[in-house]
């Protein structure tokens, strides 16, 4: 049978002769060379040589464990003479014993990572692992142990992990950003004589909102003219926040001060500045100086680092209301005045007032705006204001002037405004009343006395406040002897009636009826008009048939007394 | 006087890709936020994305229904800003209007002409 | 997301008519972030009322904007032929929102 054990080599031989692996042996062997021993598999003829008379295994190359550990091959022994084995072919195992020659080496060259700042001592930043190509399973050759080179005292590294935790307190991202920390791998278990390999961890120490908004400054001062609509900019300010993104967002508000209502603030979502804006219409003769207290908070603020103080700075802001010269501004927004339509020329009907609204109260002239008046019926004291008439009036012909009165500051023409006036003409009794249209009748020549032929109606252009009340008569040289009679209804109409029985056209064809309209205003108006009666010839049913022709012809044309 | 003038509109078939520019004058380039918005025919409006201003890292965001598609960037050097569409659908085609906020970075002040811009095969 | 619904969604009105269009946000937000344009046929929508009450640059004193919340209101005091267009408004939180718009005809 076989005589061996299982060999072992140690790796990494640097001698100058061939390595001494072991003895491939029988004891069928009698040491006479009769016996002859033949090698195969792994390596066989080449990393590993057999002398085929004792037996002797020797390697020719230096090994490397790491590359191969174990190396499998066949033994036989044959006689040499009959060439047949003397013991079965078996497989034996050449073992490759570690040595450590083999430092640990990173999963990465340069690891990145991140922590808060701020952050409580030990907390985990990452992870860092060397791997060491030597036998785990013999000696300490594979045993790693971290250590820190570079980053204490801000970092430590756990030696049997590789797990890096902070480990200083209250580190600064405002004060520090980056680190470079340099960790160290050591096998041997870290002792004396073990082989070591190094990497680089880059530390960012990421933001927590630490730190307040803080003013630059204490007061700011912002000039804006009063015109300044709402929704205007007038100033821009800035508190400083030494966080990043989210956590130096600002928010602004005016939380005191006179322009509290008066003024806004806003924060430039992108400057992160505050807008100081306009809220109301500003006066400069009211308010001058308006001063507000500003605030600049963070809206997201970390509980545990309130202890460091409120999260927001104030700032007062001093906003000077500027003077704009502005033009003239009247008592009213309109005026509306009255006058009689018999006034006289240069009779005064009102007045307007405007002030210059600004400081130096500038003085103001007037003047009527002639394309309001285009035929000068009104003028207006250019000191004073007052109103008064250059034409006579007619509330007849109008009965509202509307024009417009323009006040102008002496020392600054530019600045004017314009107010309308409504003047109403006020009517007086200076109109007779009038026919309502030209009447023109006709009496049948078998008429019967008292027999209503024609109602009369008036007209008048004046307007009494209490109304109309006309009254109607016969002119005085018609009413003796008259072939006719007025009845006055007492109701603004009169009715003309036959004063006898039948009338003959032949005799007179036409009578002409002057009559008077009276009003009963004061001072009493009169007119007369004249009504005309034709004379004509009737069916039995009083419907005309036929008149005289020269009335149709000349239907006004004069003739008798009627 | 703000100015934005939109360019590089066109018909293009579905599936294809667009860029369009938006030439900015009369202001301070830097300092604002700037948005695209689309009009599609006959319909209302629609914002298609936003990119902020160099501190805040040019930060992009944009409507659902064009992420991933579209990409908004812009160069400060030469007041521009840019429209990239890719993969573009039927139901892109509108007008692209290219817009700048008021003060203060609120709302959309100031409006170019619209630039049209036709998906379909 | 922040959903804007205007109502509504169109009137017919005249001239010298009082008008109020609403829009009302799914959550609330503040007044800052709210806004109204007016856009025209063929025309670039312009800036009629930024952060909810305040007129833009040119914009006549009959508009006015109120609210706060989740309800705000432009208002027309009283409506000229140059108003005849269409309105939204607009919230300022990523992703922006408009609202539907309000189409304002003439009766």
């Known amino acids: 049978s076989w005589m061996w054990n299982q060999f072992f080599l140690l790796e990494e031989y640097t001698g100058s002769d061939y390595q001494y692996v072991g003895k491939l042996h029988s004891d069928q062997d009698r040491g006479d060379g009769s016996l002859k021993y033949i090698l195969s598999g792994d390596g066989a003829g080449d990393l590993f040589i057999i002398n085929e008379n004792t037996g002797d295994i020797q390697a020719t190359k230096r090994l490397d464990r790491e590359e191969k550990p174990v190396y499998i091959l066949r033994a036989q022994a044959i006689n040499r003479r009959t060439g047949r084995p003397v013991e079965p072919e078996s497989e034996f195992i050449i073992k490759i014993h570690d040595i450590n020659d083999n430092e640990p080496i990173f999963t990465k060259e340069v690891y990145t990572a991140t922590v808060p700042e701020m952050s409580d001592v030990g907390t985990f930043v990452v992870q860092v692992t060397a791997t060491d190509a030597d036998d785990p399973t013999y000696g300490n050759s594979a045993k790693v142990v971290y250590s820190i080179l570079q980053g204490q005292p801000y970092f430590s590294v756990e030696s049997e992990t590789g797990i890096i935790k902070t480990a200083l307190l209250n580190m600064d991202r405002e004060n520090r950003e980056q680190y470079q920390v340099v960790i160290q791998a050591k096998d041997m278990g870290g002792q004396m004589g073990g082989l070591s390999g190094t990497t680089t961890v880059n530390i960012t120490l990421t933001d927590v909102n630490d730190n307040p908004p803080r003013f630059p400054q204490s007061t700011y001062q912002f000039k804006t003219p009063e015109s300044s609509p709402p929704g205007t900019p007038i100033g821009r300010i800035k508190a400083s926040d030494a966080d990043v993104g989210e956590n130096a967002e600002i928010e602004y508000s005016i939380t005191d001060g006179e322009g509290l209502d008066m003024f806004d603030v806003i924060t430039d979502q992108e400057t992160q500045e505050g807008i100081i804006t306009v809220k109301k219409l500003l006066d400069f003769e009211k308010k001058k100086v308006y001063t507000l207290k500003v605030e600049a908070s963070n809206p997201y603020v970390e509980p545990r680092f309130l202890y460091l103080g409120p999260f927001k700075d104030s700032a007062t802001v001093r906003i000077v209301v500027e003077d704009v010269d502005e033009p003239p501004v009247f008592s009213k927004l309109a005026y509306i005045l009255q006058i009689r339509e018999d006034a006289q020329i240069n009779t005064t009907i009102g007045s307007v007032t405007a002030q210059d609204p600004d400081a130096a109260r500038n003085p103001v002239k007037y003047s009527v705006d002639r394309h309001t008046d285009m035929d000068r019926i009104f003028n207006i004291d250019s000191g004073n204001g007052s109103i008064f008439t250059s034409k006579l009036l007619d509330r007849e012909t109008l009965l509202w002037h509307n024009i417009t009165v323009i006040a102008t500051e002496i020392n600054n023409p530019k600045q004017s405004s314009r107010v309308p006036l409504y003047i109403k003409v006020l009517d007086v009794n200076d109109n007779a009343p009038e026919f309502a249209e030209f009447y023109e009748t006709f009496v049948c020549e078998k008429a019967k006395a008292d027999q209503l032929i024609q109602t009369l109606h008036a007209v008048d252009k004046d307007d009494p406040y209490s109304g109309h009340q006309f009254s109607f008569s016969l002119a005085p040289e018609a009413a003796s002897g008259s072939n006719f009679t007025i009845q006055d209804n007492k109701d603004n109409t009169a009715g003309i009636l036959t004063r006898k029985n039948g009338y003959n056209r032949h005799e007179m064809s036409t009578y002409l009826l002057p009559v008077v309209i009276s009003d009963n205003d004061y001072p009493v108006q009169s007119s007369t008009g004249t009504v005309t009666v034709r004379v004509c010839a009737c069916d039995h049913h009083g419907n005309m048939q036929s008149c005289h022709a020269e009335a149709l012809i000349h239907p006004t044309g004069l003739s008798t007394g009627a | 006087e703000v100015q934005l003038v939109e360019s590089g509109g066109g018909l293009v078939q579905p599936g294809g890709s667009l860029r369009l520019s938006c030439a900015a004058s009369?202001?301070?380039?830097?300092?604002?936020?700037m948005n695209w918005v689309r009009q599609a025919p006959g319909k209302g409006l629609e914002w298609v994305g936003r990119?902020?201003?160099?501190?805040?890292?040019?930060?992009?965001y944009y409507a659902d229904s064009v992420t991933d598609r579209f990409t908004i960037s812009r160069d400060d050097s030469k007041n521009s800003l840019y429209l990239q569409m890719n993969s573009l659908k039927t139901e892109d085609t509108a007008v692209y209007y290219c817009?700048?906020?008021?003060?203060?970075?609120?709302?959309?002040?100031?409006w170019g002409q619209g630039t049209l811009v036709t998906v379909s095969s | 997301d922040i959903q804007l619904t205007q109502s509504p969604s169109s009137l017919s009105a005249s001239v010298g008519d009082r008008v109020t269009i609403t829009c009302s946000a799914s959550?609330?937000?503040?007044?800052?972030?709210l806004h109204w344009y007016q856009q025209k046929p063929g025309k670039s929508p312009k800036l009629l009322i930024y952060?909810?009450?305040y007129l833009a640059s040119g914009v006549p004193l009959r508009f006015s904007g109120s609210g706060s919340g989740t309800d705000f209101t432009l208002t027309i005091s009283s409506l000229q032929p140059e108003d005849f267009a269409t309105y939204y408004c607009?919230?300022?939180?990523?992703?922006?929102?408009f609202g539907q718009g309000t189409k304002l005809e003439i009766k």
């Open positions: 990119i902020r201003i160099k501190n805040n890292n040019y930060a992009t």
């Open positions: 009369g202001f301070t380039f830097t300092t604002y936020a």
């Open positions: 952060r909810s009450f």
């Open positions: 817009v700048r906020p008021d003060y203060g970075n609120y709302g959309l002040a100031y």
């Open positions: 959550s609330s937000i503040s007044s800052h972030y």
């Open positions: 607009q919230q300022d939180i990523v992703p922006l929102t």
